[in-house]
């Protein structure tokens, strides 16, 4: 098992300058760590593809809302 | 199958003008920003342009800048190039491409077309 | 606007040949770098993204490396269907810029 202590840290350093349509995103996670410079949002697209977005602007706030109540909703 | 069909280039003389369409099929275009890449005969790569997912914003290199307009049609899946005031120098082989965002930047080419070529000459 | 520059701009190696190309940013593009593959009449072909990320399909002995302003693209063993011309792309900030490419040729 590794170690989450000594897991590397992905930092964000720029952020996105565009809206990413909802449809292309998989999921998220939130960047909050000490050694990173910004809190950030790190979208992973349909395809895997990870993108770094300002959590105060608010189609990122949108979009992880839509991301949530797609988790919280069963597949029937 | 998930690709990007170009048509519309040819020989057009000095001063004239040209529109280039880019025709896309098997992915969601409208979820999508677009551009366009030339290649003059024997060099290499050189942005022009590209185009936010409604068409809103768009951006264009200074050497296009206001002879060059890109826009879309979402609801033909389609791309297009208008070029006005063509020179010599704008001839090259045209692509459109899919453009992505990543992790610390906005703007890589995940799918191209085939290309065309566009002619410039009297 | 950020230029990049490539070297060498060609080079001659053998089938099972390590390749290392370079591209060599003007000023600080983070990891914001593209490398592309394109064959003589052919569209580029995307080999790795975000400087370090490899595309989906692109056979693992393509590899890139570093965050500004010395980036590297290493081919591991060098086989047939190599032999190209390879581009760099910045996407840190507009105008996005293309390096002026390295031809890997045949020795």
């Known amino acids: 098992q590794p170690d989450a202590i000594n897991a590397p840290v992905t930092c964000c350093y720029n952020f996105t300058n565009r809206k990413i349509s909802v449809q292309r995103l998989a999921s998220y996670r939130r960047i909050t760590s000490s050694k990173c410079p910004k809190e950030a949002v790190i979208f992973k697209t349909i395809v895997a593809k990870e993108i770094c977005a300002d959590p105060k602007q608010k189609w990122v706030q949108d979009s992880m809302d839509h991301l949530d109540k797609q988790t919280q909703t069963p597949k029937t | 199958e998930v690709q990007l069909v170009q048509s519309g280039g040819g020989l057009v003389q000095p001063g004239g003008s040209l529109r280039l369409s880019c025709a896309a099929s098997?992915?969601?275009?409208?979820?999508?920003?677009m551009s366009w890449v030339r290649q003059a005969p024997g060099k290499g790569l050189e942005w022009l342009a590209n185009i936010e997912q409604d068409g809103s914003e768009k951006y264009y290199v200074d050497s296009v800048k206001g002879r060059f307009t890109i826009s879309r049609d979402n609801a033909k899946n389609s791309l297009y190039l208008q070029m006005n005031s063509l020179r010599a120098e704008d001839t090259a082989v045209y692509f459109c491409?899919?453009?992505?965002?990543?992790?610390?930047?906005?703007?890589?080419?995940?799918?191209w077309g085939r290309g065309t070529l566009v002619t410039v000459s009297s | 606007a950020i230029q990049l520059t490539q070297s060498p701009s060609s080079l001659s190696a053998s089938v099972g040949d390590r390749v290392i190309l370079i591209c060599r940013a003007s000023?600080?593009?983070?990891?914001?770098l593209a490398w592309y593959q394109q064959k003589p009449g052919k569209a580029p072909k995307l080999l790795i993204y975000?400087?370090?990320s490899l595309e989906s399909g692109v056979p693992s002995r393509f590899s890139g490396s570093g965050s500004g302003p010395d980036f590297t693209l290493t081919i591991s063993s060098l086989q047939p269907e190599d032999f190209a011309t390879y581009f760099c792309?910045?996407?840190?900030?507009?105008?996005?810029?293309f390096g002026g490419g390295t031809k890997v040729e045949i020795k």
């Open positions: 792309q910045q996407f840190n900030s507009y105008p996005l810029t």
């Open positions: 491409a899919r453009d992505l965002e990543g992790l610390h930047g906005d703007g890589y080419f995940d799918l």
């Open positions: 098997g992915f969601t275009f409208s979820h999508y920003w």
């Open positions: 975000d400087a370090s």
């Open positions: 000023q600080g593009v983070s990891s914001a």
